[in-house]
């Protein structure tokens, strides 16, 4: 079956938006007014993954770009990266595990746990203009909660 996808933007719980920082990195910063147009639009695809009552497997691509967030080991540490893919083959229902995040949603707050590295989450720093990264702690200084805004296709 073809994969189902929705376009959306994400903001962290401090209302920082996500923007491109160079070709293969995202950063989080506060945007206002016309600058909001800089924020990245994700294509959230609903993919196959492990069955769980409260976790929905998704892939996060950048709309109209052949880039997906993925989780890999770099220097023995789980790391978030933007990975280029062949647009003829993506998105697909059975995404490789490094592209899969378990969306955990409580009261419209979303967390994105790496399927490849359980208990590692898409995270932002408290500080402005810092890279979006994969963090291994929840409830600490770093931010792991996001809100989602729908975008028309």
């Amino acid at each position: 079956a073809p994969v189902r996808s929705l376009n959306c933007t994400l903001r962290d719980s401090q209302q920082k938006s996500l923007v491109m920082s160079g070709p293969y990195e995202l950063k989080a910063l506060h945007l206002q007014g016309q600058d909001m147009e800089q924020q990245v639009v994700f294509s959230m695809s609903f993919v196959q993954g492990e069955e769980s009552n409260d976790k929905i497997p998704v892939a996060l691509g950048l709309k109209e770009k052949n880039l997906y967030l993925s989780c890999v080991l770099k220097d023995d540490k789980p790391t978030l990266q933007l990975e280029s893919v062949d647009p003829k083959n993506y998105p697909k229902k059975k995404m490789e595990k490094r592209f899969v995040f378990n969306k955990i949603e409580i009261n419209n707050k979303l967390e994105f746990e790496s399927a490849q590295f359980p208990n590692w989450y898409i995270s932002t720093s408290q500080a402005e203009n810092m890279p979006v990264f994969l963090g291994g702690t929840k409830g600490g200084q770093d931010i792991t909660d996001f809100t989602m805004q729908f975008v028309s296709s």
């Epitope: 079956a1 069955e51 419209n108």
Partner: antibody
Framework: QVQLVQSGAEVKKPGASVKVSCKVS????????IEWVRQAPGKGLEWIGE????????NYNEKFKGKATITADTSTDTAYMELSSLRSEDTAVYYC?????????????WGQGTLVTVSS | DIQMTQSPSSLSASVGDRVTITCKAS??????LSWFQQKPGKAPKSLIY???RLVDGVPSRFSGSASGTDYTLTISSLQPEDFATYYC?????????FGQGTKLEIK
């Protein structure tokens, strides 16, 4: 609690149009697909299409393209389905239902149904 | 379109009986399978989603399972209020498709 309240029964002549409404309460309207399903007298259930009010995305059953037009008004938390060029075969009960935007929860809540009768 | 072949089309049973209704999907539906109960003149009522997850408020005598592309609804001990028509639904691929229905009658 979640409620979907549909508009009342309609009797229409062949060739006419009808617009059925589905007013929802008890949840965030923008985050749930509104599904439309029909049931002809004594028959089974048939999926017509869906709309996600949060972004206006619509998916139709090819069979109903050109027959059904699905819209949503986020200011009133109401979804609509208009049926055009009505024929006797369109006589049915039309239901709205909901499913969360990530498709996980199934068609959990249903409206009471709207009977549309097409007769000359 | 994905075909959902539901069987049996009708079934007679007694209060206390264990009954099973099956839907066979014509292709993989990634567990996007729901079951509904409908009584005459009423809207369908959701019982189960994602094959086996019970909707809040649905009695535990209802259960769902899967084996390959075969999906089963089981009622462990029929109660008088369970006599109705049951439908499966696949919502993995457009157009979403329902089974033809199983009418469960009192023997």
């Amino acid at each position: 609690q979640v409620q979907l309240v549909q508009s009342g029964a309609e009797v229409k002549k062949p060739g006419a149009s009808v617009k059925v409404s589905c007013k929802v309460s008890g949840y965030t309207f923008s985050r749930y697909w509104i599904e439309w399903v029909r049931q002809a007298p004594g028959k089974g259930l048939e999926w017509i299409g869906e709309i996600l009010p949060g972004n206006g995305n619509i998916n139709y059953n090819e069979k109903f393209k050109g027959k059904a037009t699905i819209t949503a008004d986020t200011s009133t938390d109401t979804a609509y389905m208009e049926l055009s060029s009505l024929r006797s075969e369109d006589t049915a009960v039309y239901y709205c239902s909901t499913i969360y935007y990530d498709y996980d929860q199934g068609f959990t809540y249903w409206g009471q149904g709207t009977l549309v009768t097409v007769s000359s | 379109d994905i075909q959902m072949t539901q069987s049996p089309s009708s079934l007679s049973a007694s209060v206390g009986d264990r009954v099973t209704i099956t839907c066979k999907a014509s292709q993989d539906i990634d567990r996007y399978l729901s079951w509904f109960q409908q009584k005459p003149g009423k809207a369908p009522k959701s019982l189960i989603y994602r094959v086996k997850r019970l909707v809040d408020g649905v009695p535990s005598r209802f259960s769902g399972s899967a084996s390959g592309t075969d999906y089963t609804l089981t009622i462990s001990s029929l109660q008088p209020e369970d006599f109705a028509t049951y439908y499966c639904l696949q919502y993995d691929e457009f157009p979403y498709t329902f089974g033809q229905g199983t009418k469960l009658e009192i023997k």
